[in-house]
């Protein structure tokens, strides 16, 4: 049994940031989840963590140097990336993990999204691309 | 409280294999990684590699990937390392511990450690 | 493979002092770096998490900070059950790999 997700499948990122969307077909309310954001036809670099459960406060947090933010609803997750690179642009894919209740339950590989970074280019710091939230 | 029971010491020849089991309790088994790190006598600590239980997914270091296989029985909450072709150089304390699903960065929680000696 | 540096291997110290270990990246891991103490014997327990971030029932006197490739450990006033062996290891990419230890022995 496996969680569909819907998401746009373009977003244009003006002055480097863009919200992107992941609507899922589960209610995640009074779930232990992980909902992540993934780069690249491949998936291969995660962008973005929220991490959920019934008992804690939401958190966000990015371990490839990525800015960004998460809000939660009871059926989706919305990803607010700042500070991107022009050459960022590239798809995106939503993932959503439910650890508990048992069984463990995962998505369909969605769509996708293309982001397209227009805007300011940034001049990356060469160790630290952004502050990624604890 | 929240523990990691490991199985007892093991004497093995070169050449055969090893299994060490690693029993959780006073946590959900499903909302952690189950790692495993060895230390042989005076050396580095290393990763081996870990499971997730919720989806039996793996992840290996390179080094061990074609002689380490990790399991687990969700029914009874254990993880399993099983360590194939022993040479003397695997003799070392291997240790389980836990990451955390959703926030996986540290090892919280350890297990007593296992002594695995490999001797002819 | 991201390699973990850590010095010095050993040293000595007395009841009271501050104490300082450095661990060094070999590229960029962010915050994503974490301490261990280790007693013989006895399985390593965490001490700091995400480099700075003081674990349950650690004593303040520990305290960790740095970003990027290079961190630190300081222990602010070493007490008896302080001397054992310090690890750090990165949790940013797998595999997870750990520095080679620091000793903190009686001088």
């Known amino acids: 049994n496996k969680i569909l997700v819907k998401q746009s499948p373009m977003l244009v990122a003006y002055d480097n940031a863009v919200n992107l969307s992941c609507k899922y077909s589960y209610n995640l309310f009074s779930r232990e989840f992980r909902a992540s954001l993934h780069k690249g036809l491949d998936s291969a670099v995660e962008v973005c963590v929220v991490y959920g459960n019934y008992s804690q406060q939401l958190q966000v947090y990015s371990k490839t140097g990525f800015n960004c933010d998460g809000k939660l609803g009871n059926e989706s997750v919305t990803f607010y990336l700042q500070n991107l690179y022009v050459n960022q642009t590239d798809i995106y894919f939503c993932k959503i993990e439910v650890m508990y209740p048992p069984p463990y339950l995962d998505n369909e590989k969605s769509n996708g999204t293309i982001i397209h970074v227009k805007g300011k280019h940034l001049c990356p710091s060469p160790l630290f691309p952004g502050p990624s939230k604890p | 409280q929240v523990q990691l029971v490991q199985s007892g010491a093991e004497v093995k020849k070169p050449g055969a294999s090893v299994k060490v089991s690693c029993k959780a309790s006073?946590?959900?088994?499903?909302?952690?990684?189950i790692h495993w790190v060895r230390q042989a006598p005076g050396q580095c600590l290393e990763w081996i590699g870990c499971?997730?239980?919720?989806?039996?997914?793996?992840n290996y270091n390179e080094k061990f990937k074609d002689r380490a296989t990790l399991t687990v029985d969700t029914s009874i909450s254990t993880a399993y390392m099983e360590l194939s072709r022993l040479r003397s150089d695997d003799t070392a304390v291997y240790f389980c511990?836990?990451?955390?699903?959703?926030?996986?960065?540290?090892?919280?929680?350890w297990g007593q450690g296992t002594t695995v000696t490999v001797s002819s | 493979d991201i390699q973990m540096t850590q010095s010095p291997s050993s040293l000595s110290a007395s009841v009271g002092d501050r104490v300082t270990i450095t661990c060094h990246a070999s590229?960029?891991?962010?915050?994503?770096l974490n301490w261990y103490q280790q007693k013989p014997g006895k399985a390593p327990k965490l001490l700091i998490y995400?480099?700075?971030n003081l674990h349950t029932g650690v004593p303040s006197r520990f305290s960790g900070s740095g970003s990027g490739t290079d961190f630190t450990l300081t222990i602010s006033s070493l007490q008896p059950e302080d001397f054992a062996t310090y690890y750090c290891?990165?949790?940013?990419?797998?595999?997870?790999?750990f520095g080679c230890g620091t000793k903190v022995e009686i001088k």
């Open positions: 995400k480099a700075s």
């Open positions: 499971i997730y239980p919720g989806n039996v997914n793996t």
């Open positions: 590229q960029n891991i962010y915050v994503w």
């Open positions: 006073g946590y959900t088994f499903t909302s952690y990684y």
């Open positions: 290891q990165q949790g940013q990419t797998y595999p997870y790999t």
């Open positions: 511990t836990r990451s955390h699903y959703g926030l996986d960065w540290n090892f919280d929680v």
